[in-house]
Interface confidence: low
């Protein structure tokens, strides 16, 4: 069966493209200018020597996906440059399967297995060379290319060191068994970035976890800077297709960011789902629950299909600083269901944050501790104080009359008033816990349109500190 596949591989199906090889391995050496002639071919050792292929170094294979243009896109050149900058001695090979990828999507999907087999044959041949080790091989596949990488890892004799799936394609792969898509069995370590997943309409990227660790930046769906307004602002003809491209391709740019901005690494946190992450529940680094993203992701034992989440900026560098905030809202009377809008401003030794809204994922729990996630784009340094604001809302005359009557019967406590004594904060990036208290223990109440200040009053929450990601991932 493999021979049949191999036979069908050599050329694209019809037309002028039939003369061209359907899969080409373009070896991109960082030694000197790029040379068109550096194409690798099974059984031909000369190009390896001509182009200074380093048998003992890391070898990256970059695999593109389905294409509308029929050309190698800009992201690929950026990724090649970033890899060469980060790993100066490494071999970078671009797997060019354009004649098969620039077809109907369904036809391109049907070619992924055969392209994966071609990559596996190349790896099998290279394994016969002195010094070459599969453990040093890192396959990086974008969209359909991620599944090509999976097939290559499945077909190769031995185990590839690592596969990175950059928003693996969803249509025709979602929900299928592990032998028909990228899966954790395809390499020693499979890490995946999901940036265009949708639970409604068509999901261009695969929603299900398919690696050892599966990272969902911004929940894996709406990427900052990719809204229609953002896209319209940055190009002359913004379309839904541009939004799709922006979000789908964001996975590549996050990976490039992890290569070039080594001093600003982003961290992801293990969580069962996006909603729990949005609540700020999942900012722990205990038991390998946090990890670097992109190139900085590290293999951890016994993890498989582990979902991890983080927030990002709209552009490079993508790193943000995550904080968990725990606030206990005391209510001295039954106020019914309230939906307050709270904002916080964080003040640190380096800077102060913008005004950050506390996203209420479900509903405020009264006389209960509520957890929130906030994140800042700048490094604030050590936190010193917090300003909490309850946004005033317009109310009807009836509401005001009720509040006035309530005040007459109980002058000290107007309706829709809450009491907050302290805010507990945990930094995702440093894993430091801090407690912030009101200045005057007698003045803890807040009502719509008012603000309350909290000052650092304790290191920790009276609990032992957890490991910080910077320690764990260095």
């Amino acid at each position: 069966a493999e021979e049949q596949l191999e036979g069908g591989l050599r050329t694209a199906k019809d037309g002028p493209a039939a003369a061209k090889a359907a899969v080409r391995f373009h070896f991109r050496t960082s030694k000197g200018p790029e040379r068109e002639g550096c194409y690798l071919s099974v059984g031909h050792s000369q190009p390896l020597e001509d182009c200074s292929f380093n048998m003992t170094a890391k070898t990256f294979f970059i695999i593109h996906g389905w294409t509308m243009s029929g050309m190698l896109e800009n992201w690929l050149h950026k990724l090649v440059s970033a890899l060469q900058m980060r790993e100066k001695d490494a071999n970078v090979v671009v797997v060019d399967w354009l004649p098969l990828a620039h077809q109907l999507y369904t036809d391109a999907v049907n070619s992924t297995r055969v392209v994966g087999l071609s990559v596996a044959k190349m790896l099998d041949w290279l394994q016969g060379k002195d010094g070459f080790s599969l453990g040093n091989v890192h396959l990086i596949g974008y969209s359909l290319g991620a599944h090509v990488a999976g097939f290559a890892g499945n077909f190769v004799k031995g185990t590839v060191g690592r596969i990175t799936g950059l928003d693996p394609a969803g249509p025709m792969f979602e929900g299928v068994d592990i032998h028909r898509r990228l899966s954790p069995d395809d390499a020693d370590f499979v890490d995946v970035l999901h940036t265009y997943t949708r639970s409604f309409g068509i999901s261009i990227g695969i929603q299900m976890p398919v690696g050892h660790i599966d990272i969902y930046p911004n929940g894996g769906d709406f990427q900052p800077g990719c809204g229609l307004n953002d896209v319209l602002g940055s190009i002359a003809y913004g379309t839904i297709a541009e939004v799709v491209k922006c979000e789908h391709e964001r996975a590549v740019h996050l990976f490039v960011d992890s290569l070039v901005n080594q001093d600003k690494p982003s961290f992801a946190f293990q969580c069962t789902d996006s909603n729990r992450f949005k609540k700020g529940i999942c900012l722990s680094c205990r038991k390998n629950r946090c990890n670097g993203i992109g190139y900085n992701a590290k293999k951890t034992r016994n993890k498989r299909n582990t979902k991890m989440y983080l927030k990002t900026r709209a552009g490079m560098p993508f790193r943000v600083y995550h904080y968990q905030m725990k606030i206990h809202f005391f209510s001295y009377k039954s106020v019914g269901a309230i939906e307050p809008t709270f904002y916080v401003t964080l003040y640190g030794t380096n800077a102060e944050s913008q005004v950050l809204s506390l996203e209420i994922v479900e509903q405020i729990g009264l006389n209960a501790t509520n957890t929130f996630l906030v994140y800042t784009e700048e490094d604030l340094g050590d936190l010193l104080k917090i300003k909490l604001t309850w946004e005033g809302t317009s109310r009807s005359w009836y509401d005001l009359w009720r509040e006035f009557r309530s005040y007459l019967s109980q002058p000290h406590r107007p309706e829709r008033e809450l009491s907050i004594r302290r805010i507990r904060v945990k930094s995702g990036e440093t894993q430091r816990r801090l407690t912030f208290c009101v200045e005057d223990p007698e003045k803890t109440s807040i009502a719509p349109g008012q603000e309350l200040w909290f000052y650092k009053c304790r290191d920790g929450w009276r609990m032992k500190n957890e490991t910080s990601p910077t320690v764990e991932l260095s």
Epitope: A12, K13, D14, G15, P16, A17, W66, M68, S69, G70, M71, P99, H102, Q103, L104, Y105, T106, D107, P171, M172, I202, I204, I240, A241, V244, K245
Partner: antibody
Framework: EVQLQQSGPELLKPGASVKISCKAS????????MHWVKQSHGKSLEWIGS????????SYNEKFKDKATLTVDKSSNTAYMEFRSLTSEDCAVYYC????????????WGQGTTLTVSS | ENVLTQSPAIMSASLGEKVTMSCRAS?????MYWYQQKSDASPKLWIY???NLAPGVPDRFSGSGSGNSYSLTISSMEGEDAATYYC?????????FGGGTKLEIK
């Protein structure tokens, strides 16, 4: 606005050849595959084949392989379908259709070209 | 080739009535696509990826199915829905269409 403007109706004799055109506007011509579909009078639709304008790669329905030839002229954003050795079986409306954005379906169709073959 | 069989070939429905038409494939397909065609007009994309409505298609339309069996449903028939509906597959070449279901107003 995306438009596919097809050439006018054709009346030809059996054995002749015809070249139908489909001029695309409102989008980047080379970024979308162009397909051709046949609809005989009162009948269903039949896929003839497709052409990738970027490098001219074609794909045909086996049934039409000896009948149709698909070409493009990138300079004028026009796709062509040539039909040879015409018979009465070829009497039909022929549509060009753009294979749509990102993952694929026929999102825009030409208005159709009616081909009549009669002696 | 994958033969798509649509049923019924012709059907009529009263305004406000629920309408369901089906499309069976001789071999399993990944997704089904539906097109609407009115007389003397080109087909229009109506439903893509089995259940997604094309822009401008009223939400009374819905699509469903998997494997070999797919259907298009109109929750409440309106006059403008009278047309012929074709199903189509892209899973394997040649890309085939069903014979069509002609929907008329009763």
């Amino acid at each position: 606005e995306v438009q596919l403007q097809q050439s006018g109706p054709e009346l030809l004799k059996p054995g002749a050849s015809v070249k139908i055109s489909c001029k695309a506007s409102g989008y980047t011509f080379t970024e979308y595959t162009m397909h051709w579909v046949k609809q005989s009078h009162g009948k269903s639709l039949e896929w003839i084949g497709s052409i990738n304008p970027y490098y001219g790669g074609t794909s045909y329905n086996e049934k039409f392989k000896d009948k149709a030839t698909l070409t493009v002229d990138k300079s004028s954003n026009t796709a062509y379908m040539e039909f040879r050795s015409l018979t009465s079986e070829d009497c039909a409306v022929y549509y060009c259709a753009r294979y749509g954005n990102y993952v694929g379906y026929f999102d825009y169709w030409g208005q159709g070209t009616t081909l009549t073959v009669s002696s | 080739e994958n033969v798509l069989t649509q049923s019924p070939a012709i059907m009529s429905a009263s305004l406000g009535e629920k309408v369901t038409m089906s499309c069976r494939a001789s071999s399993s397909v990944h997704y089904m696509y539906w097109y609407q065609q009115k007389s003397d007009a080109s087909p229009k994309l109506w439903i893509y990826y089995t259940s997604n409505l094309a822009p401008g298609v009223p939400d009374r339309f819905s699509g469903s199915g998997s494997g070999n069996s797919y259907s298009l449903t109109i929750s409440s028939m309106e006059g403008e829905d009278a047309a012929t509906y074709y199903c189509q597959q892209f899973t394997s070449s040649p890309y085939t269409f069903g014979g069509g279901t002609k929907l008329e107003i009763k």
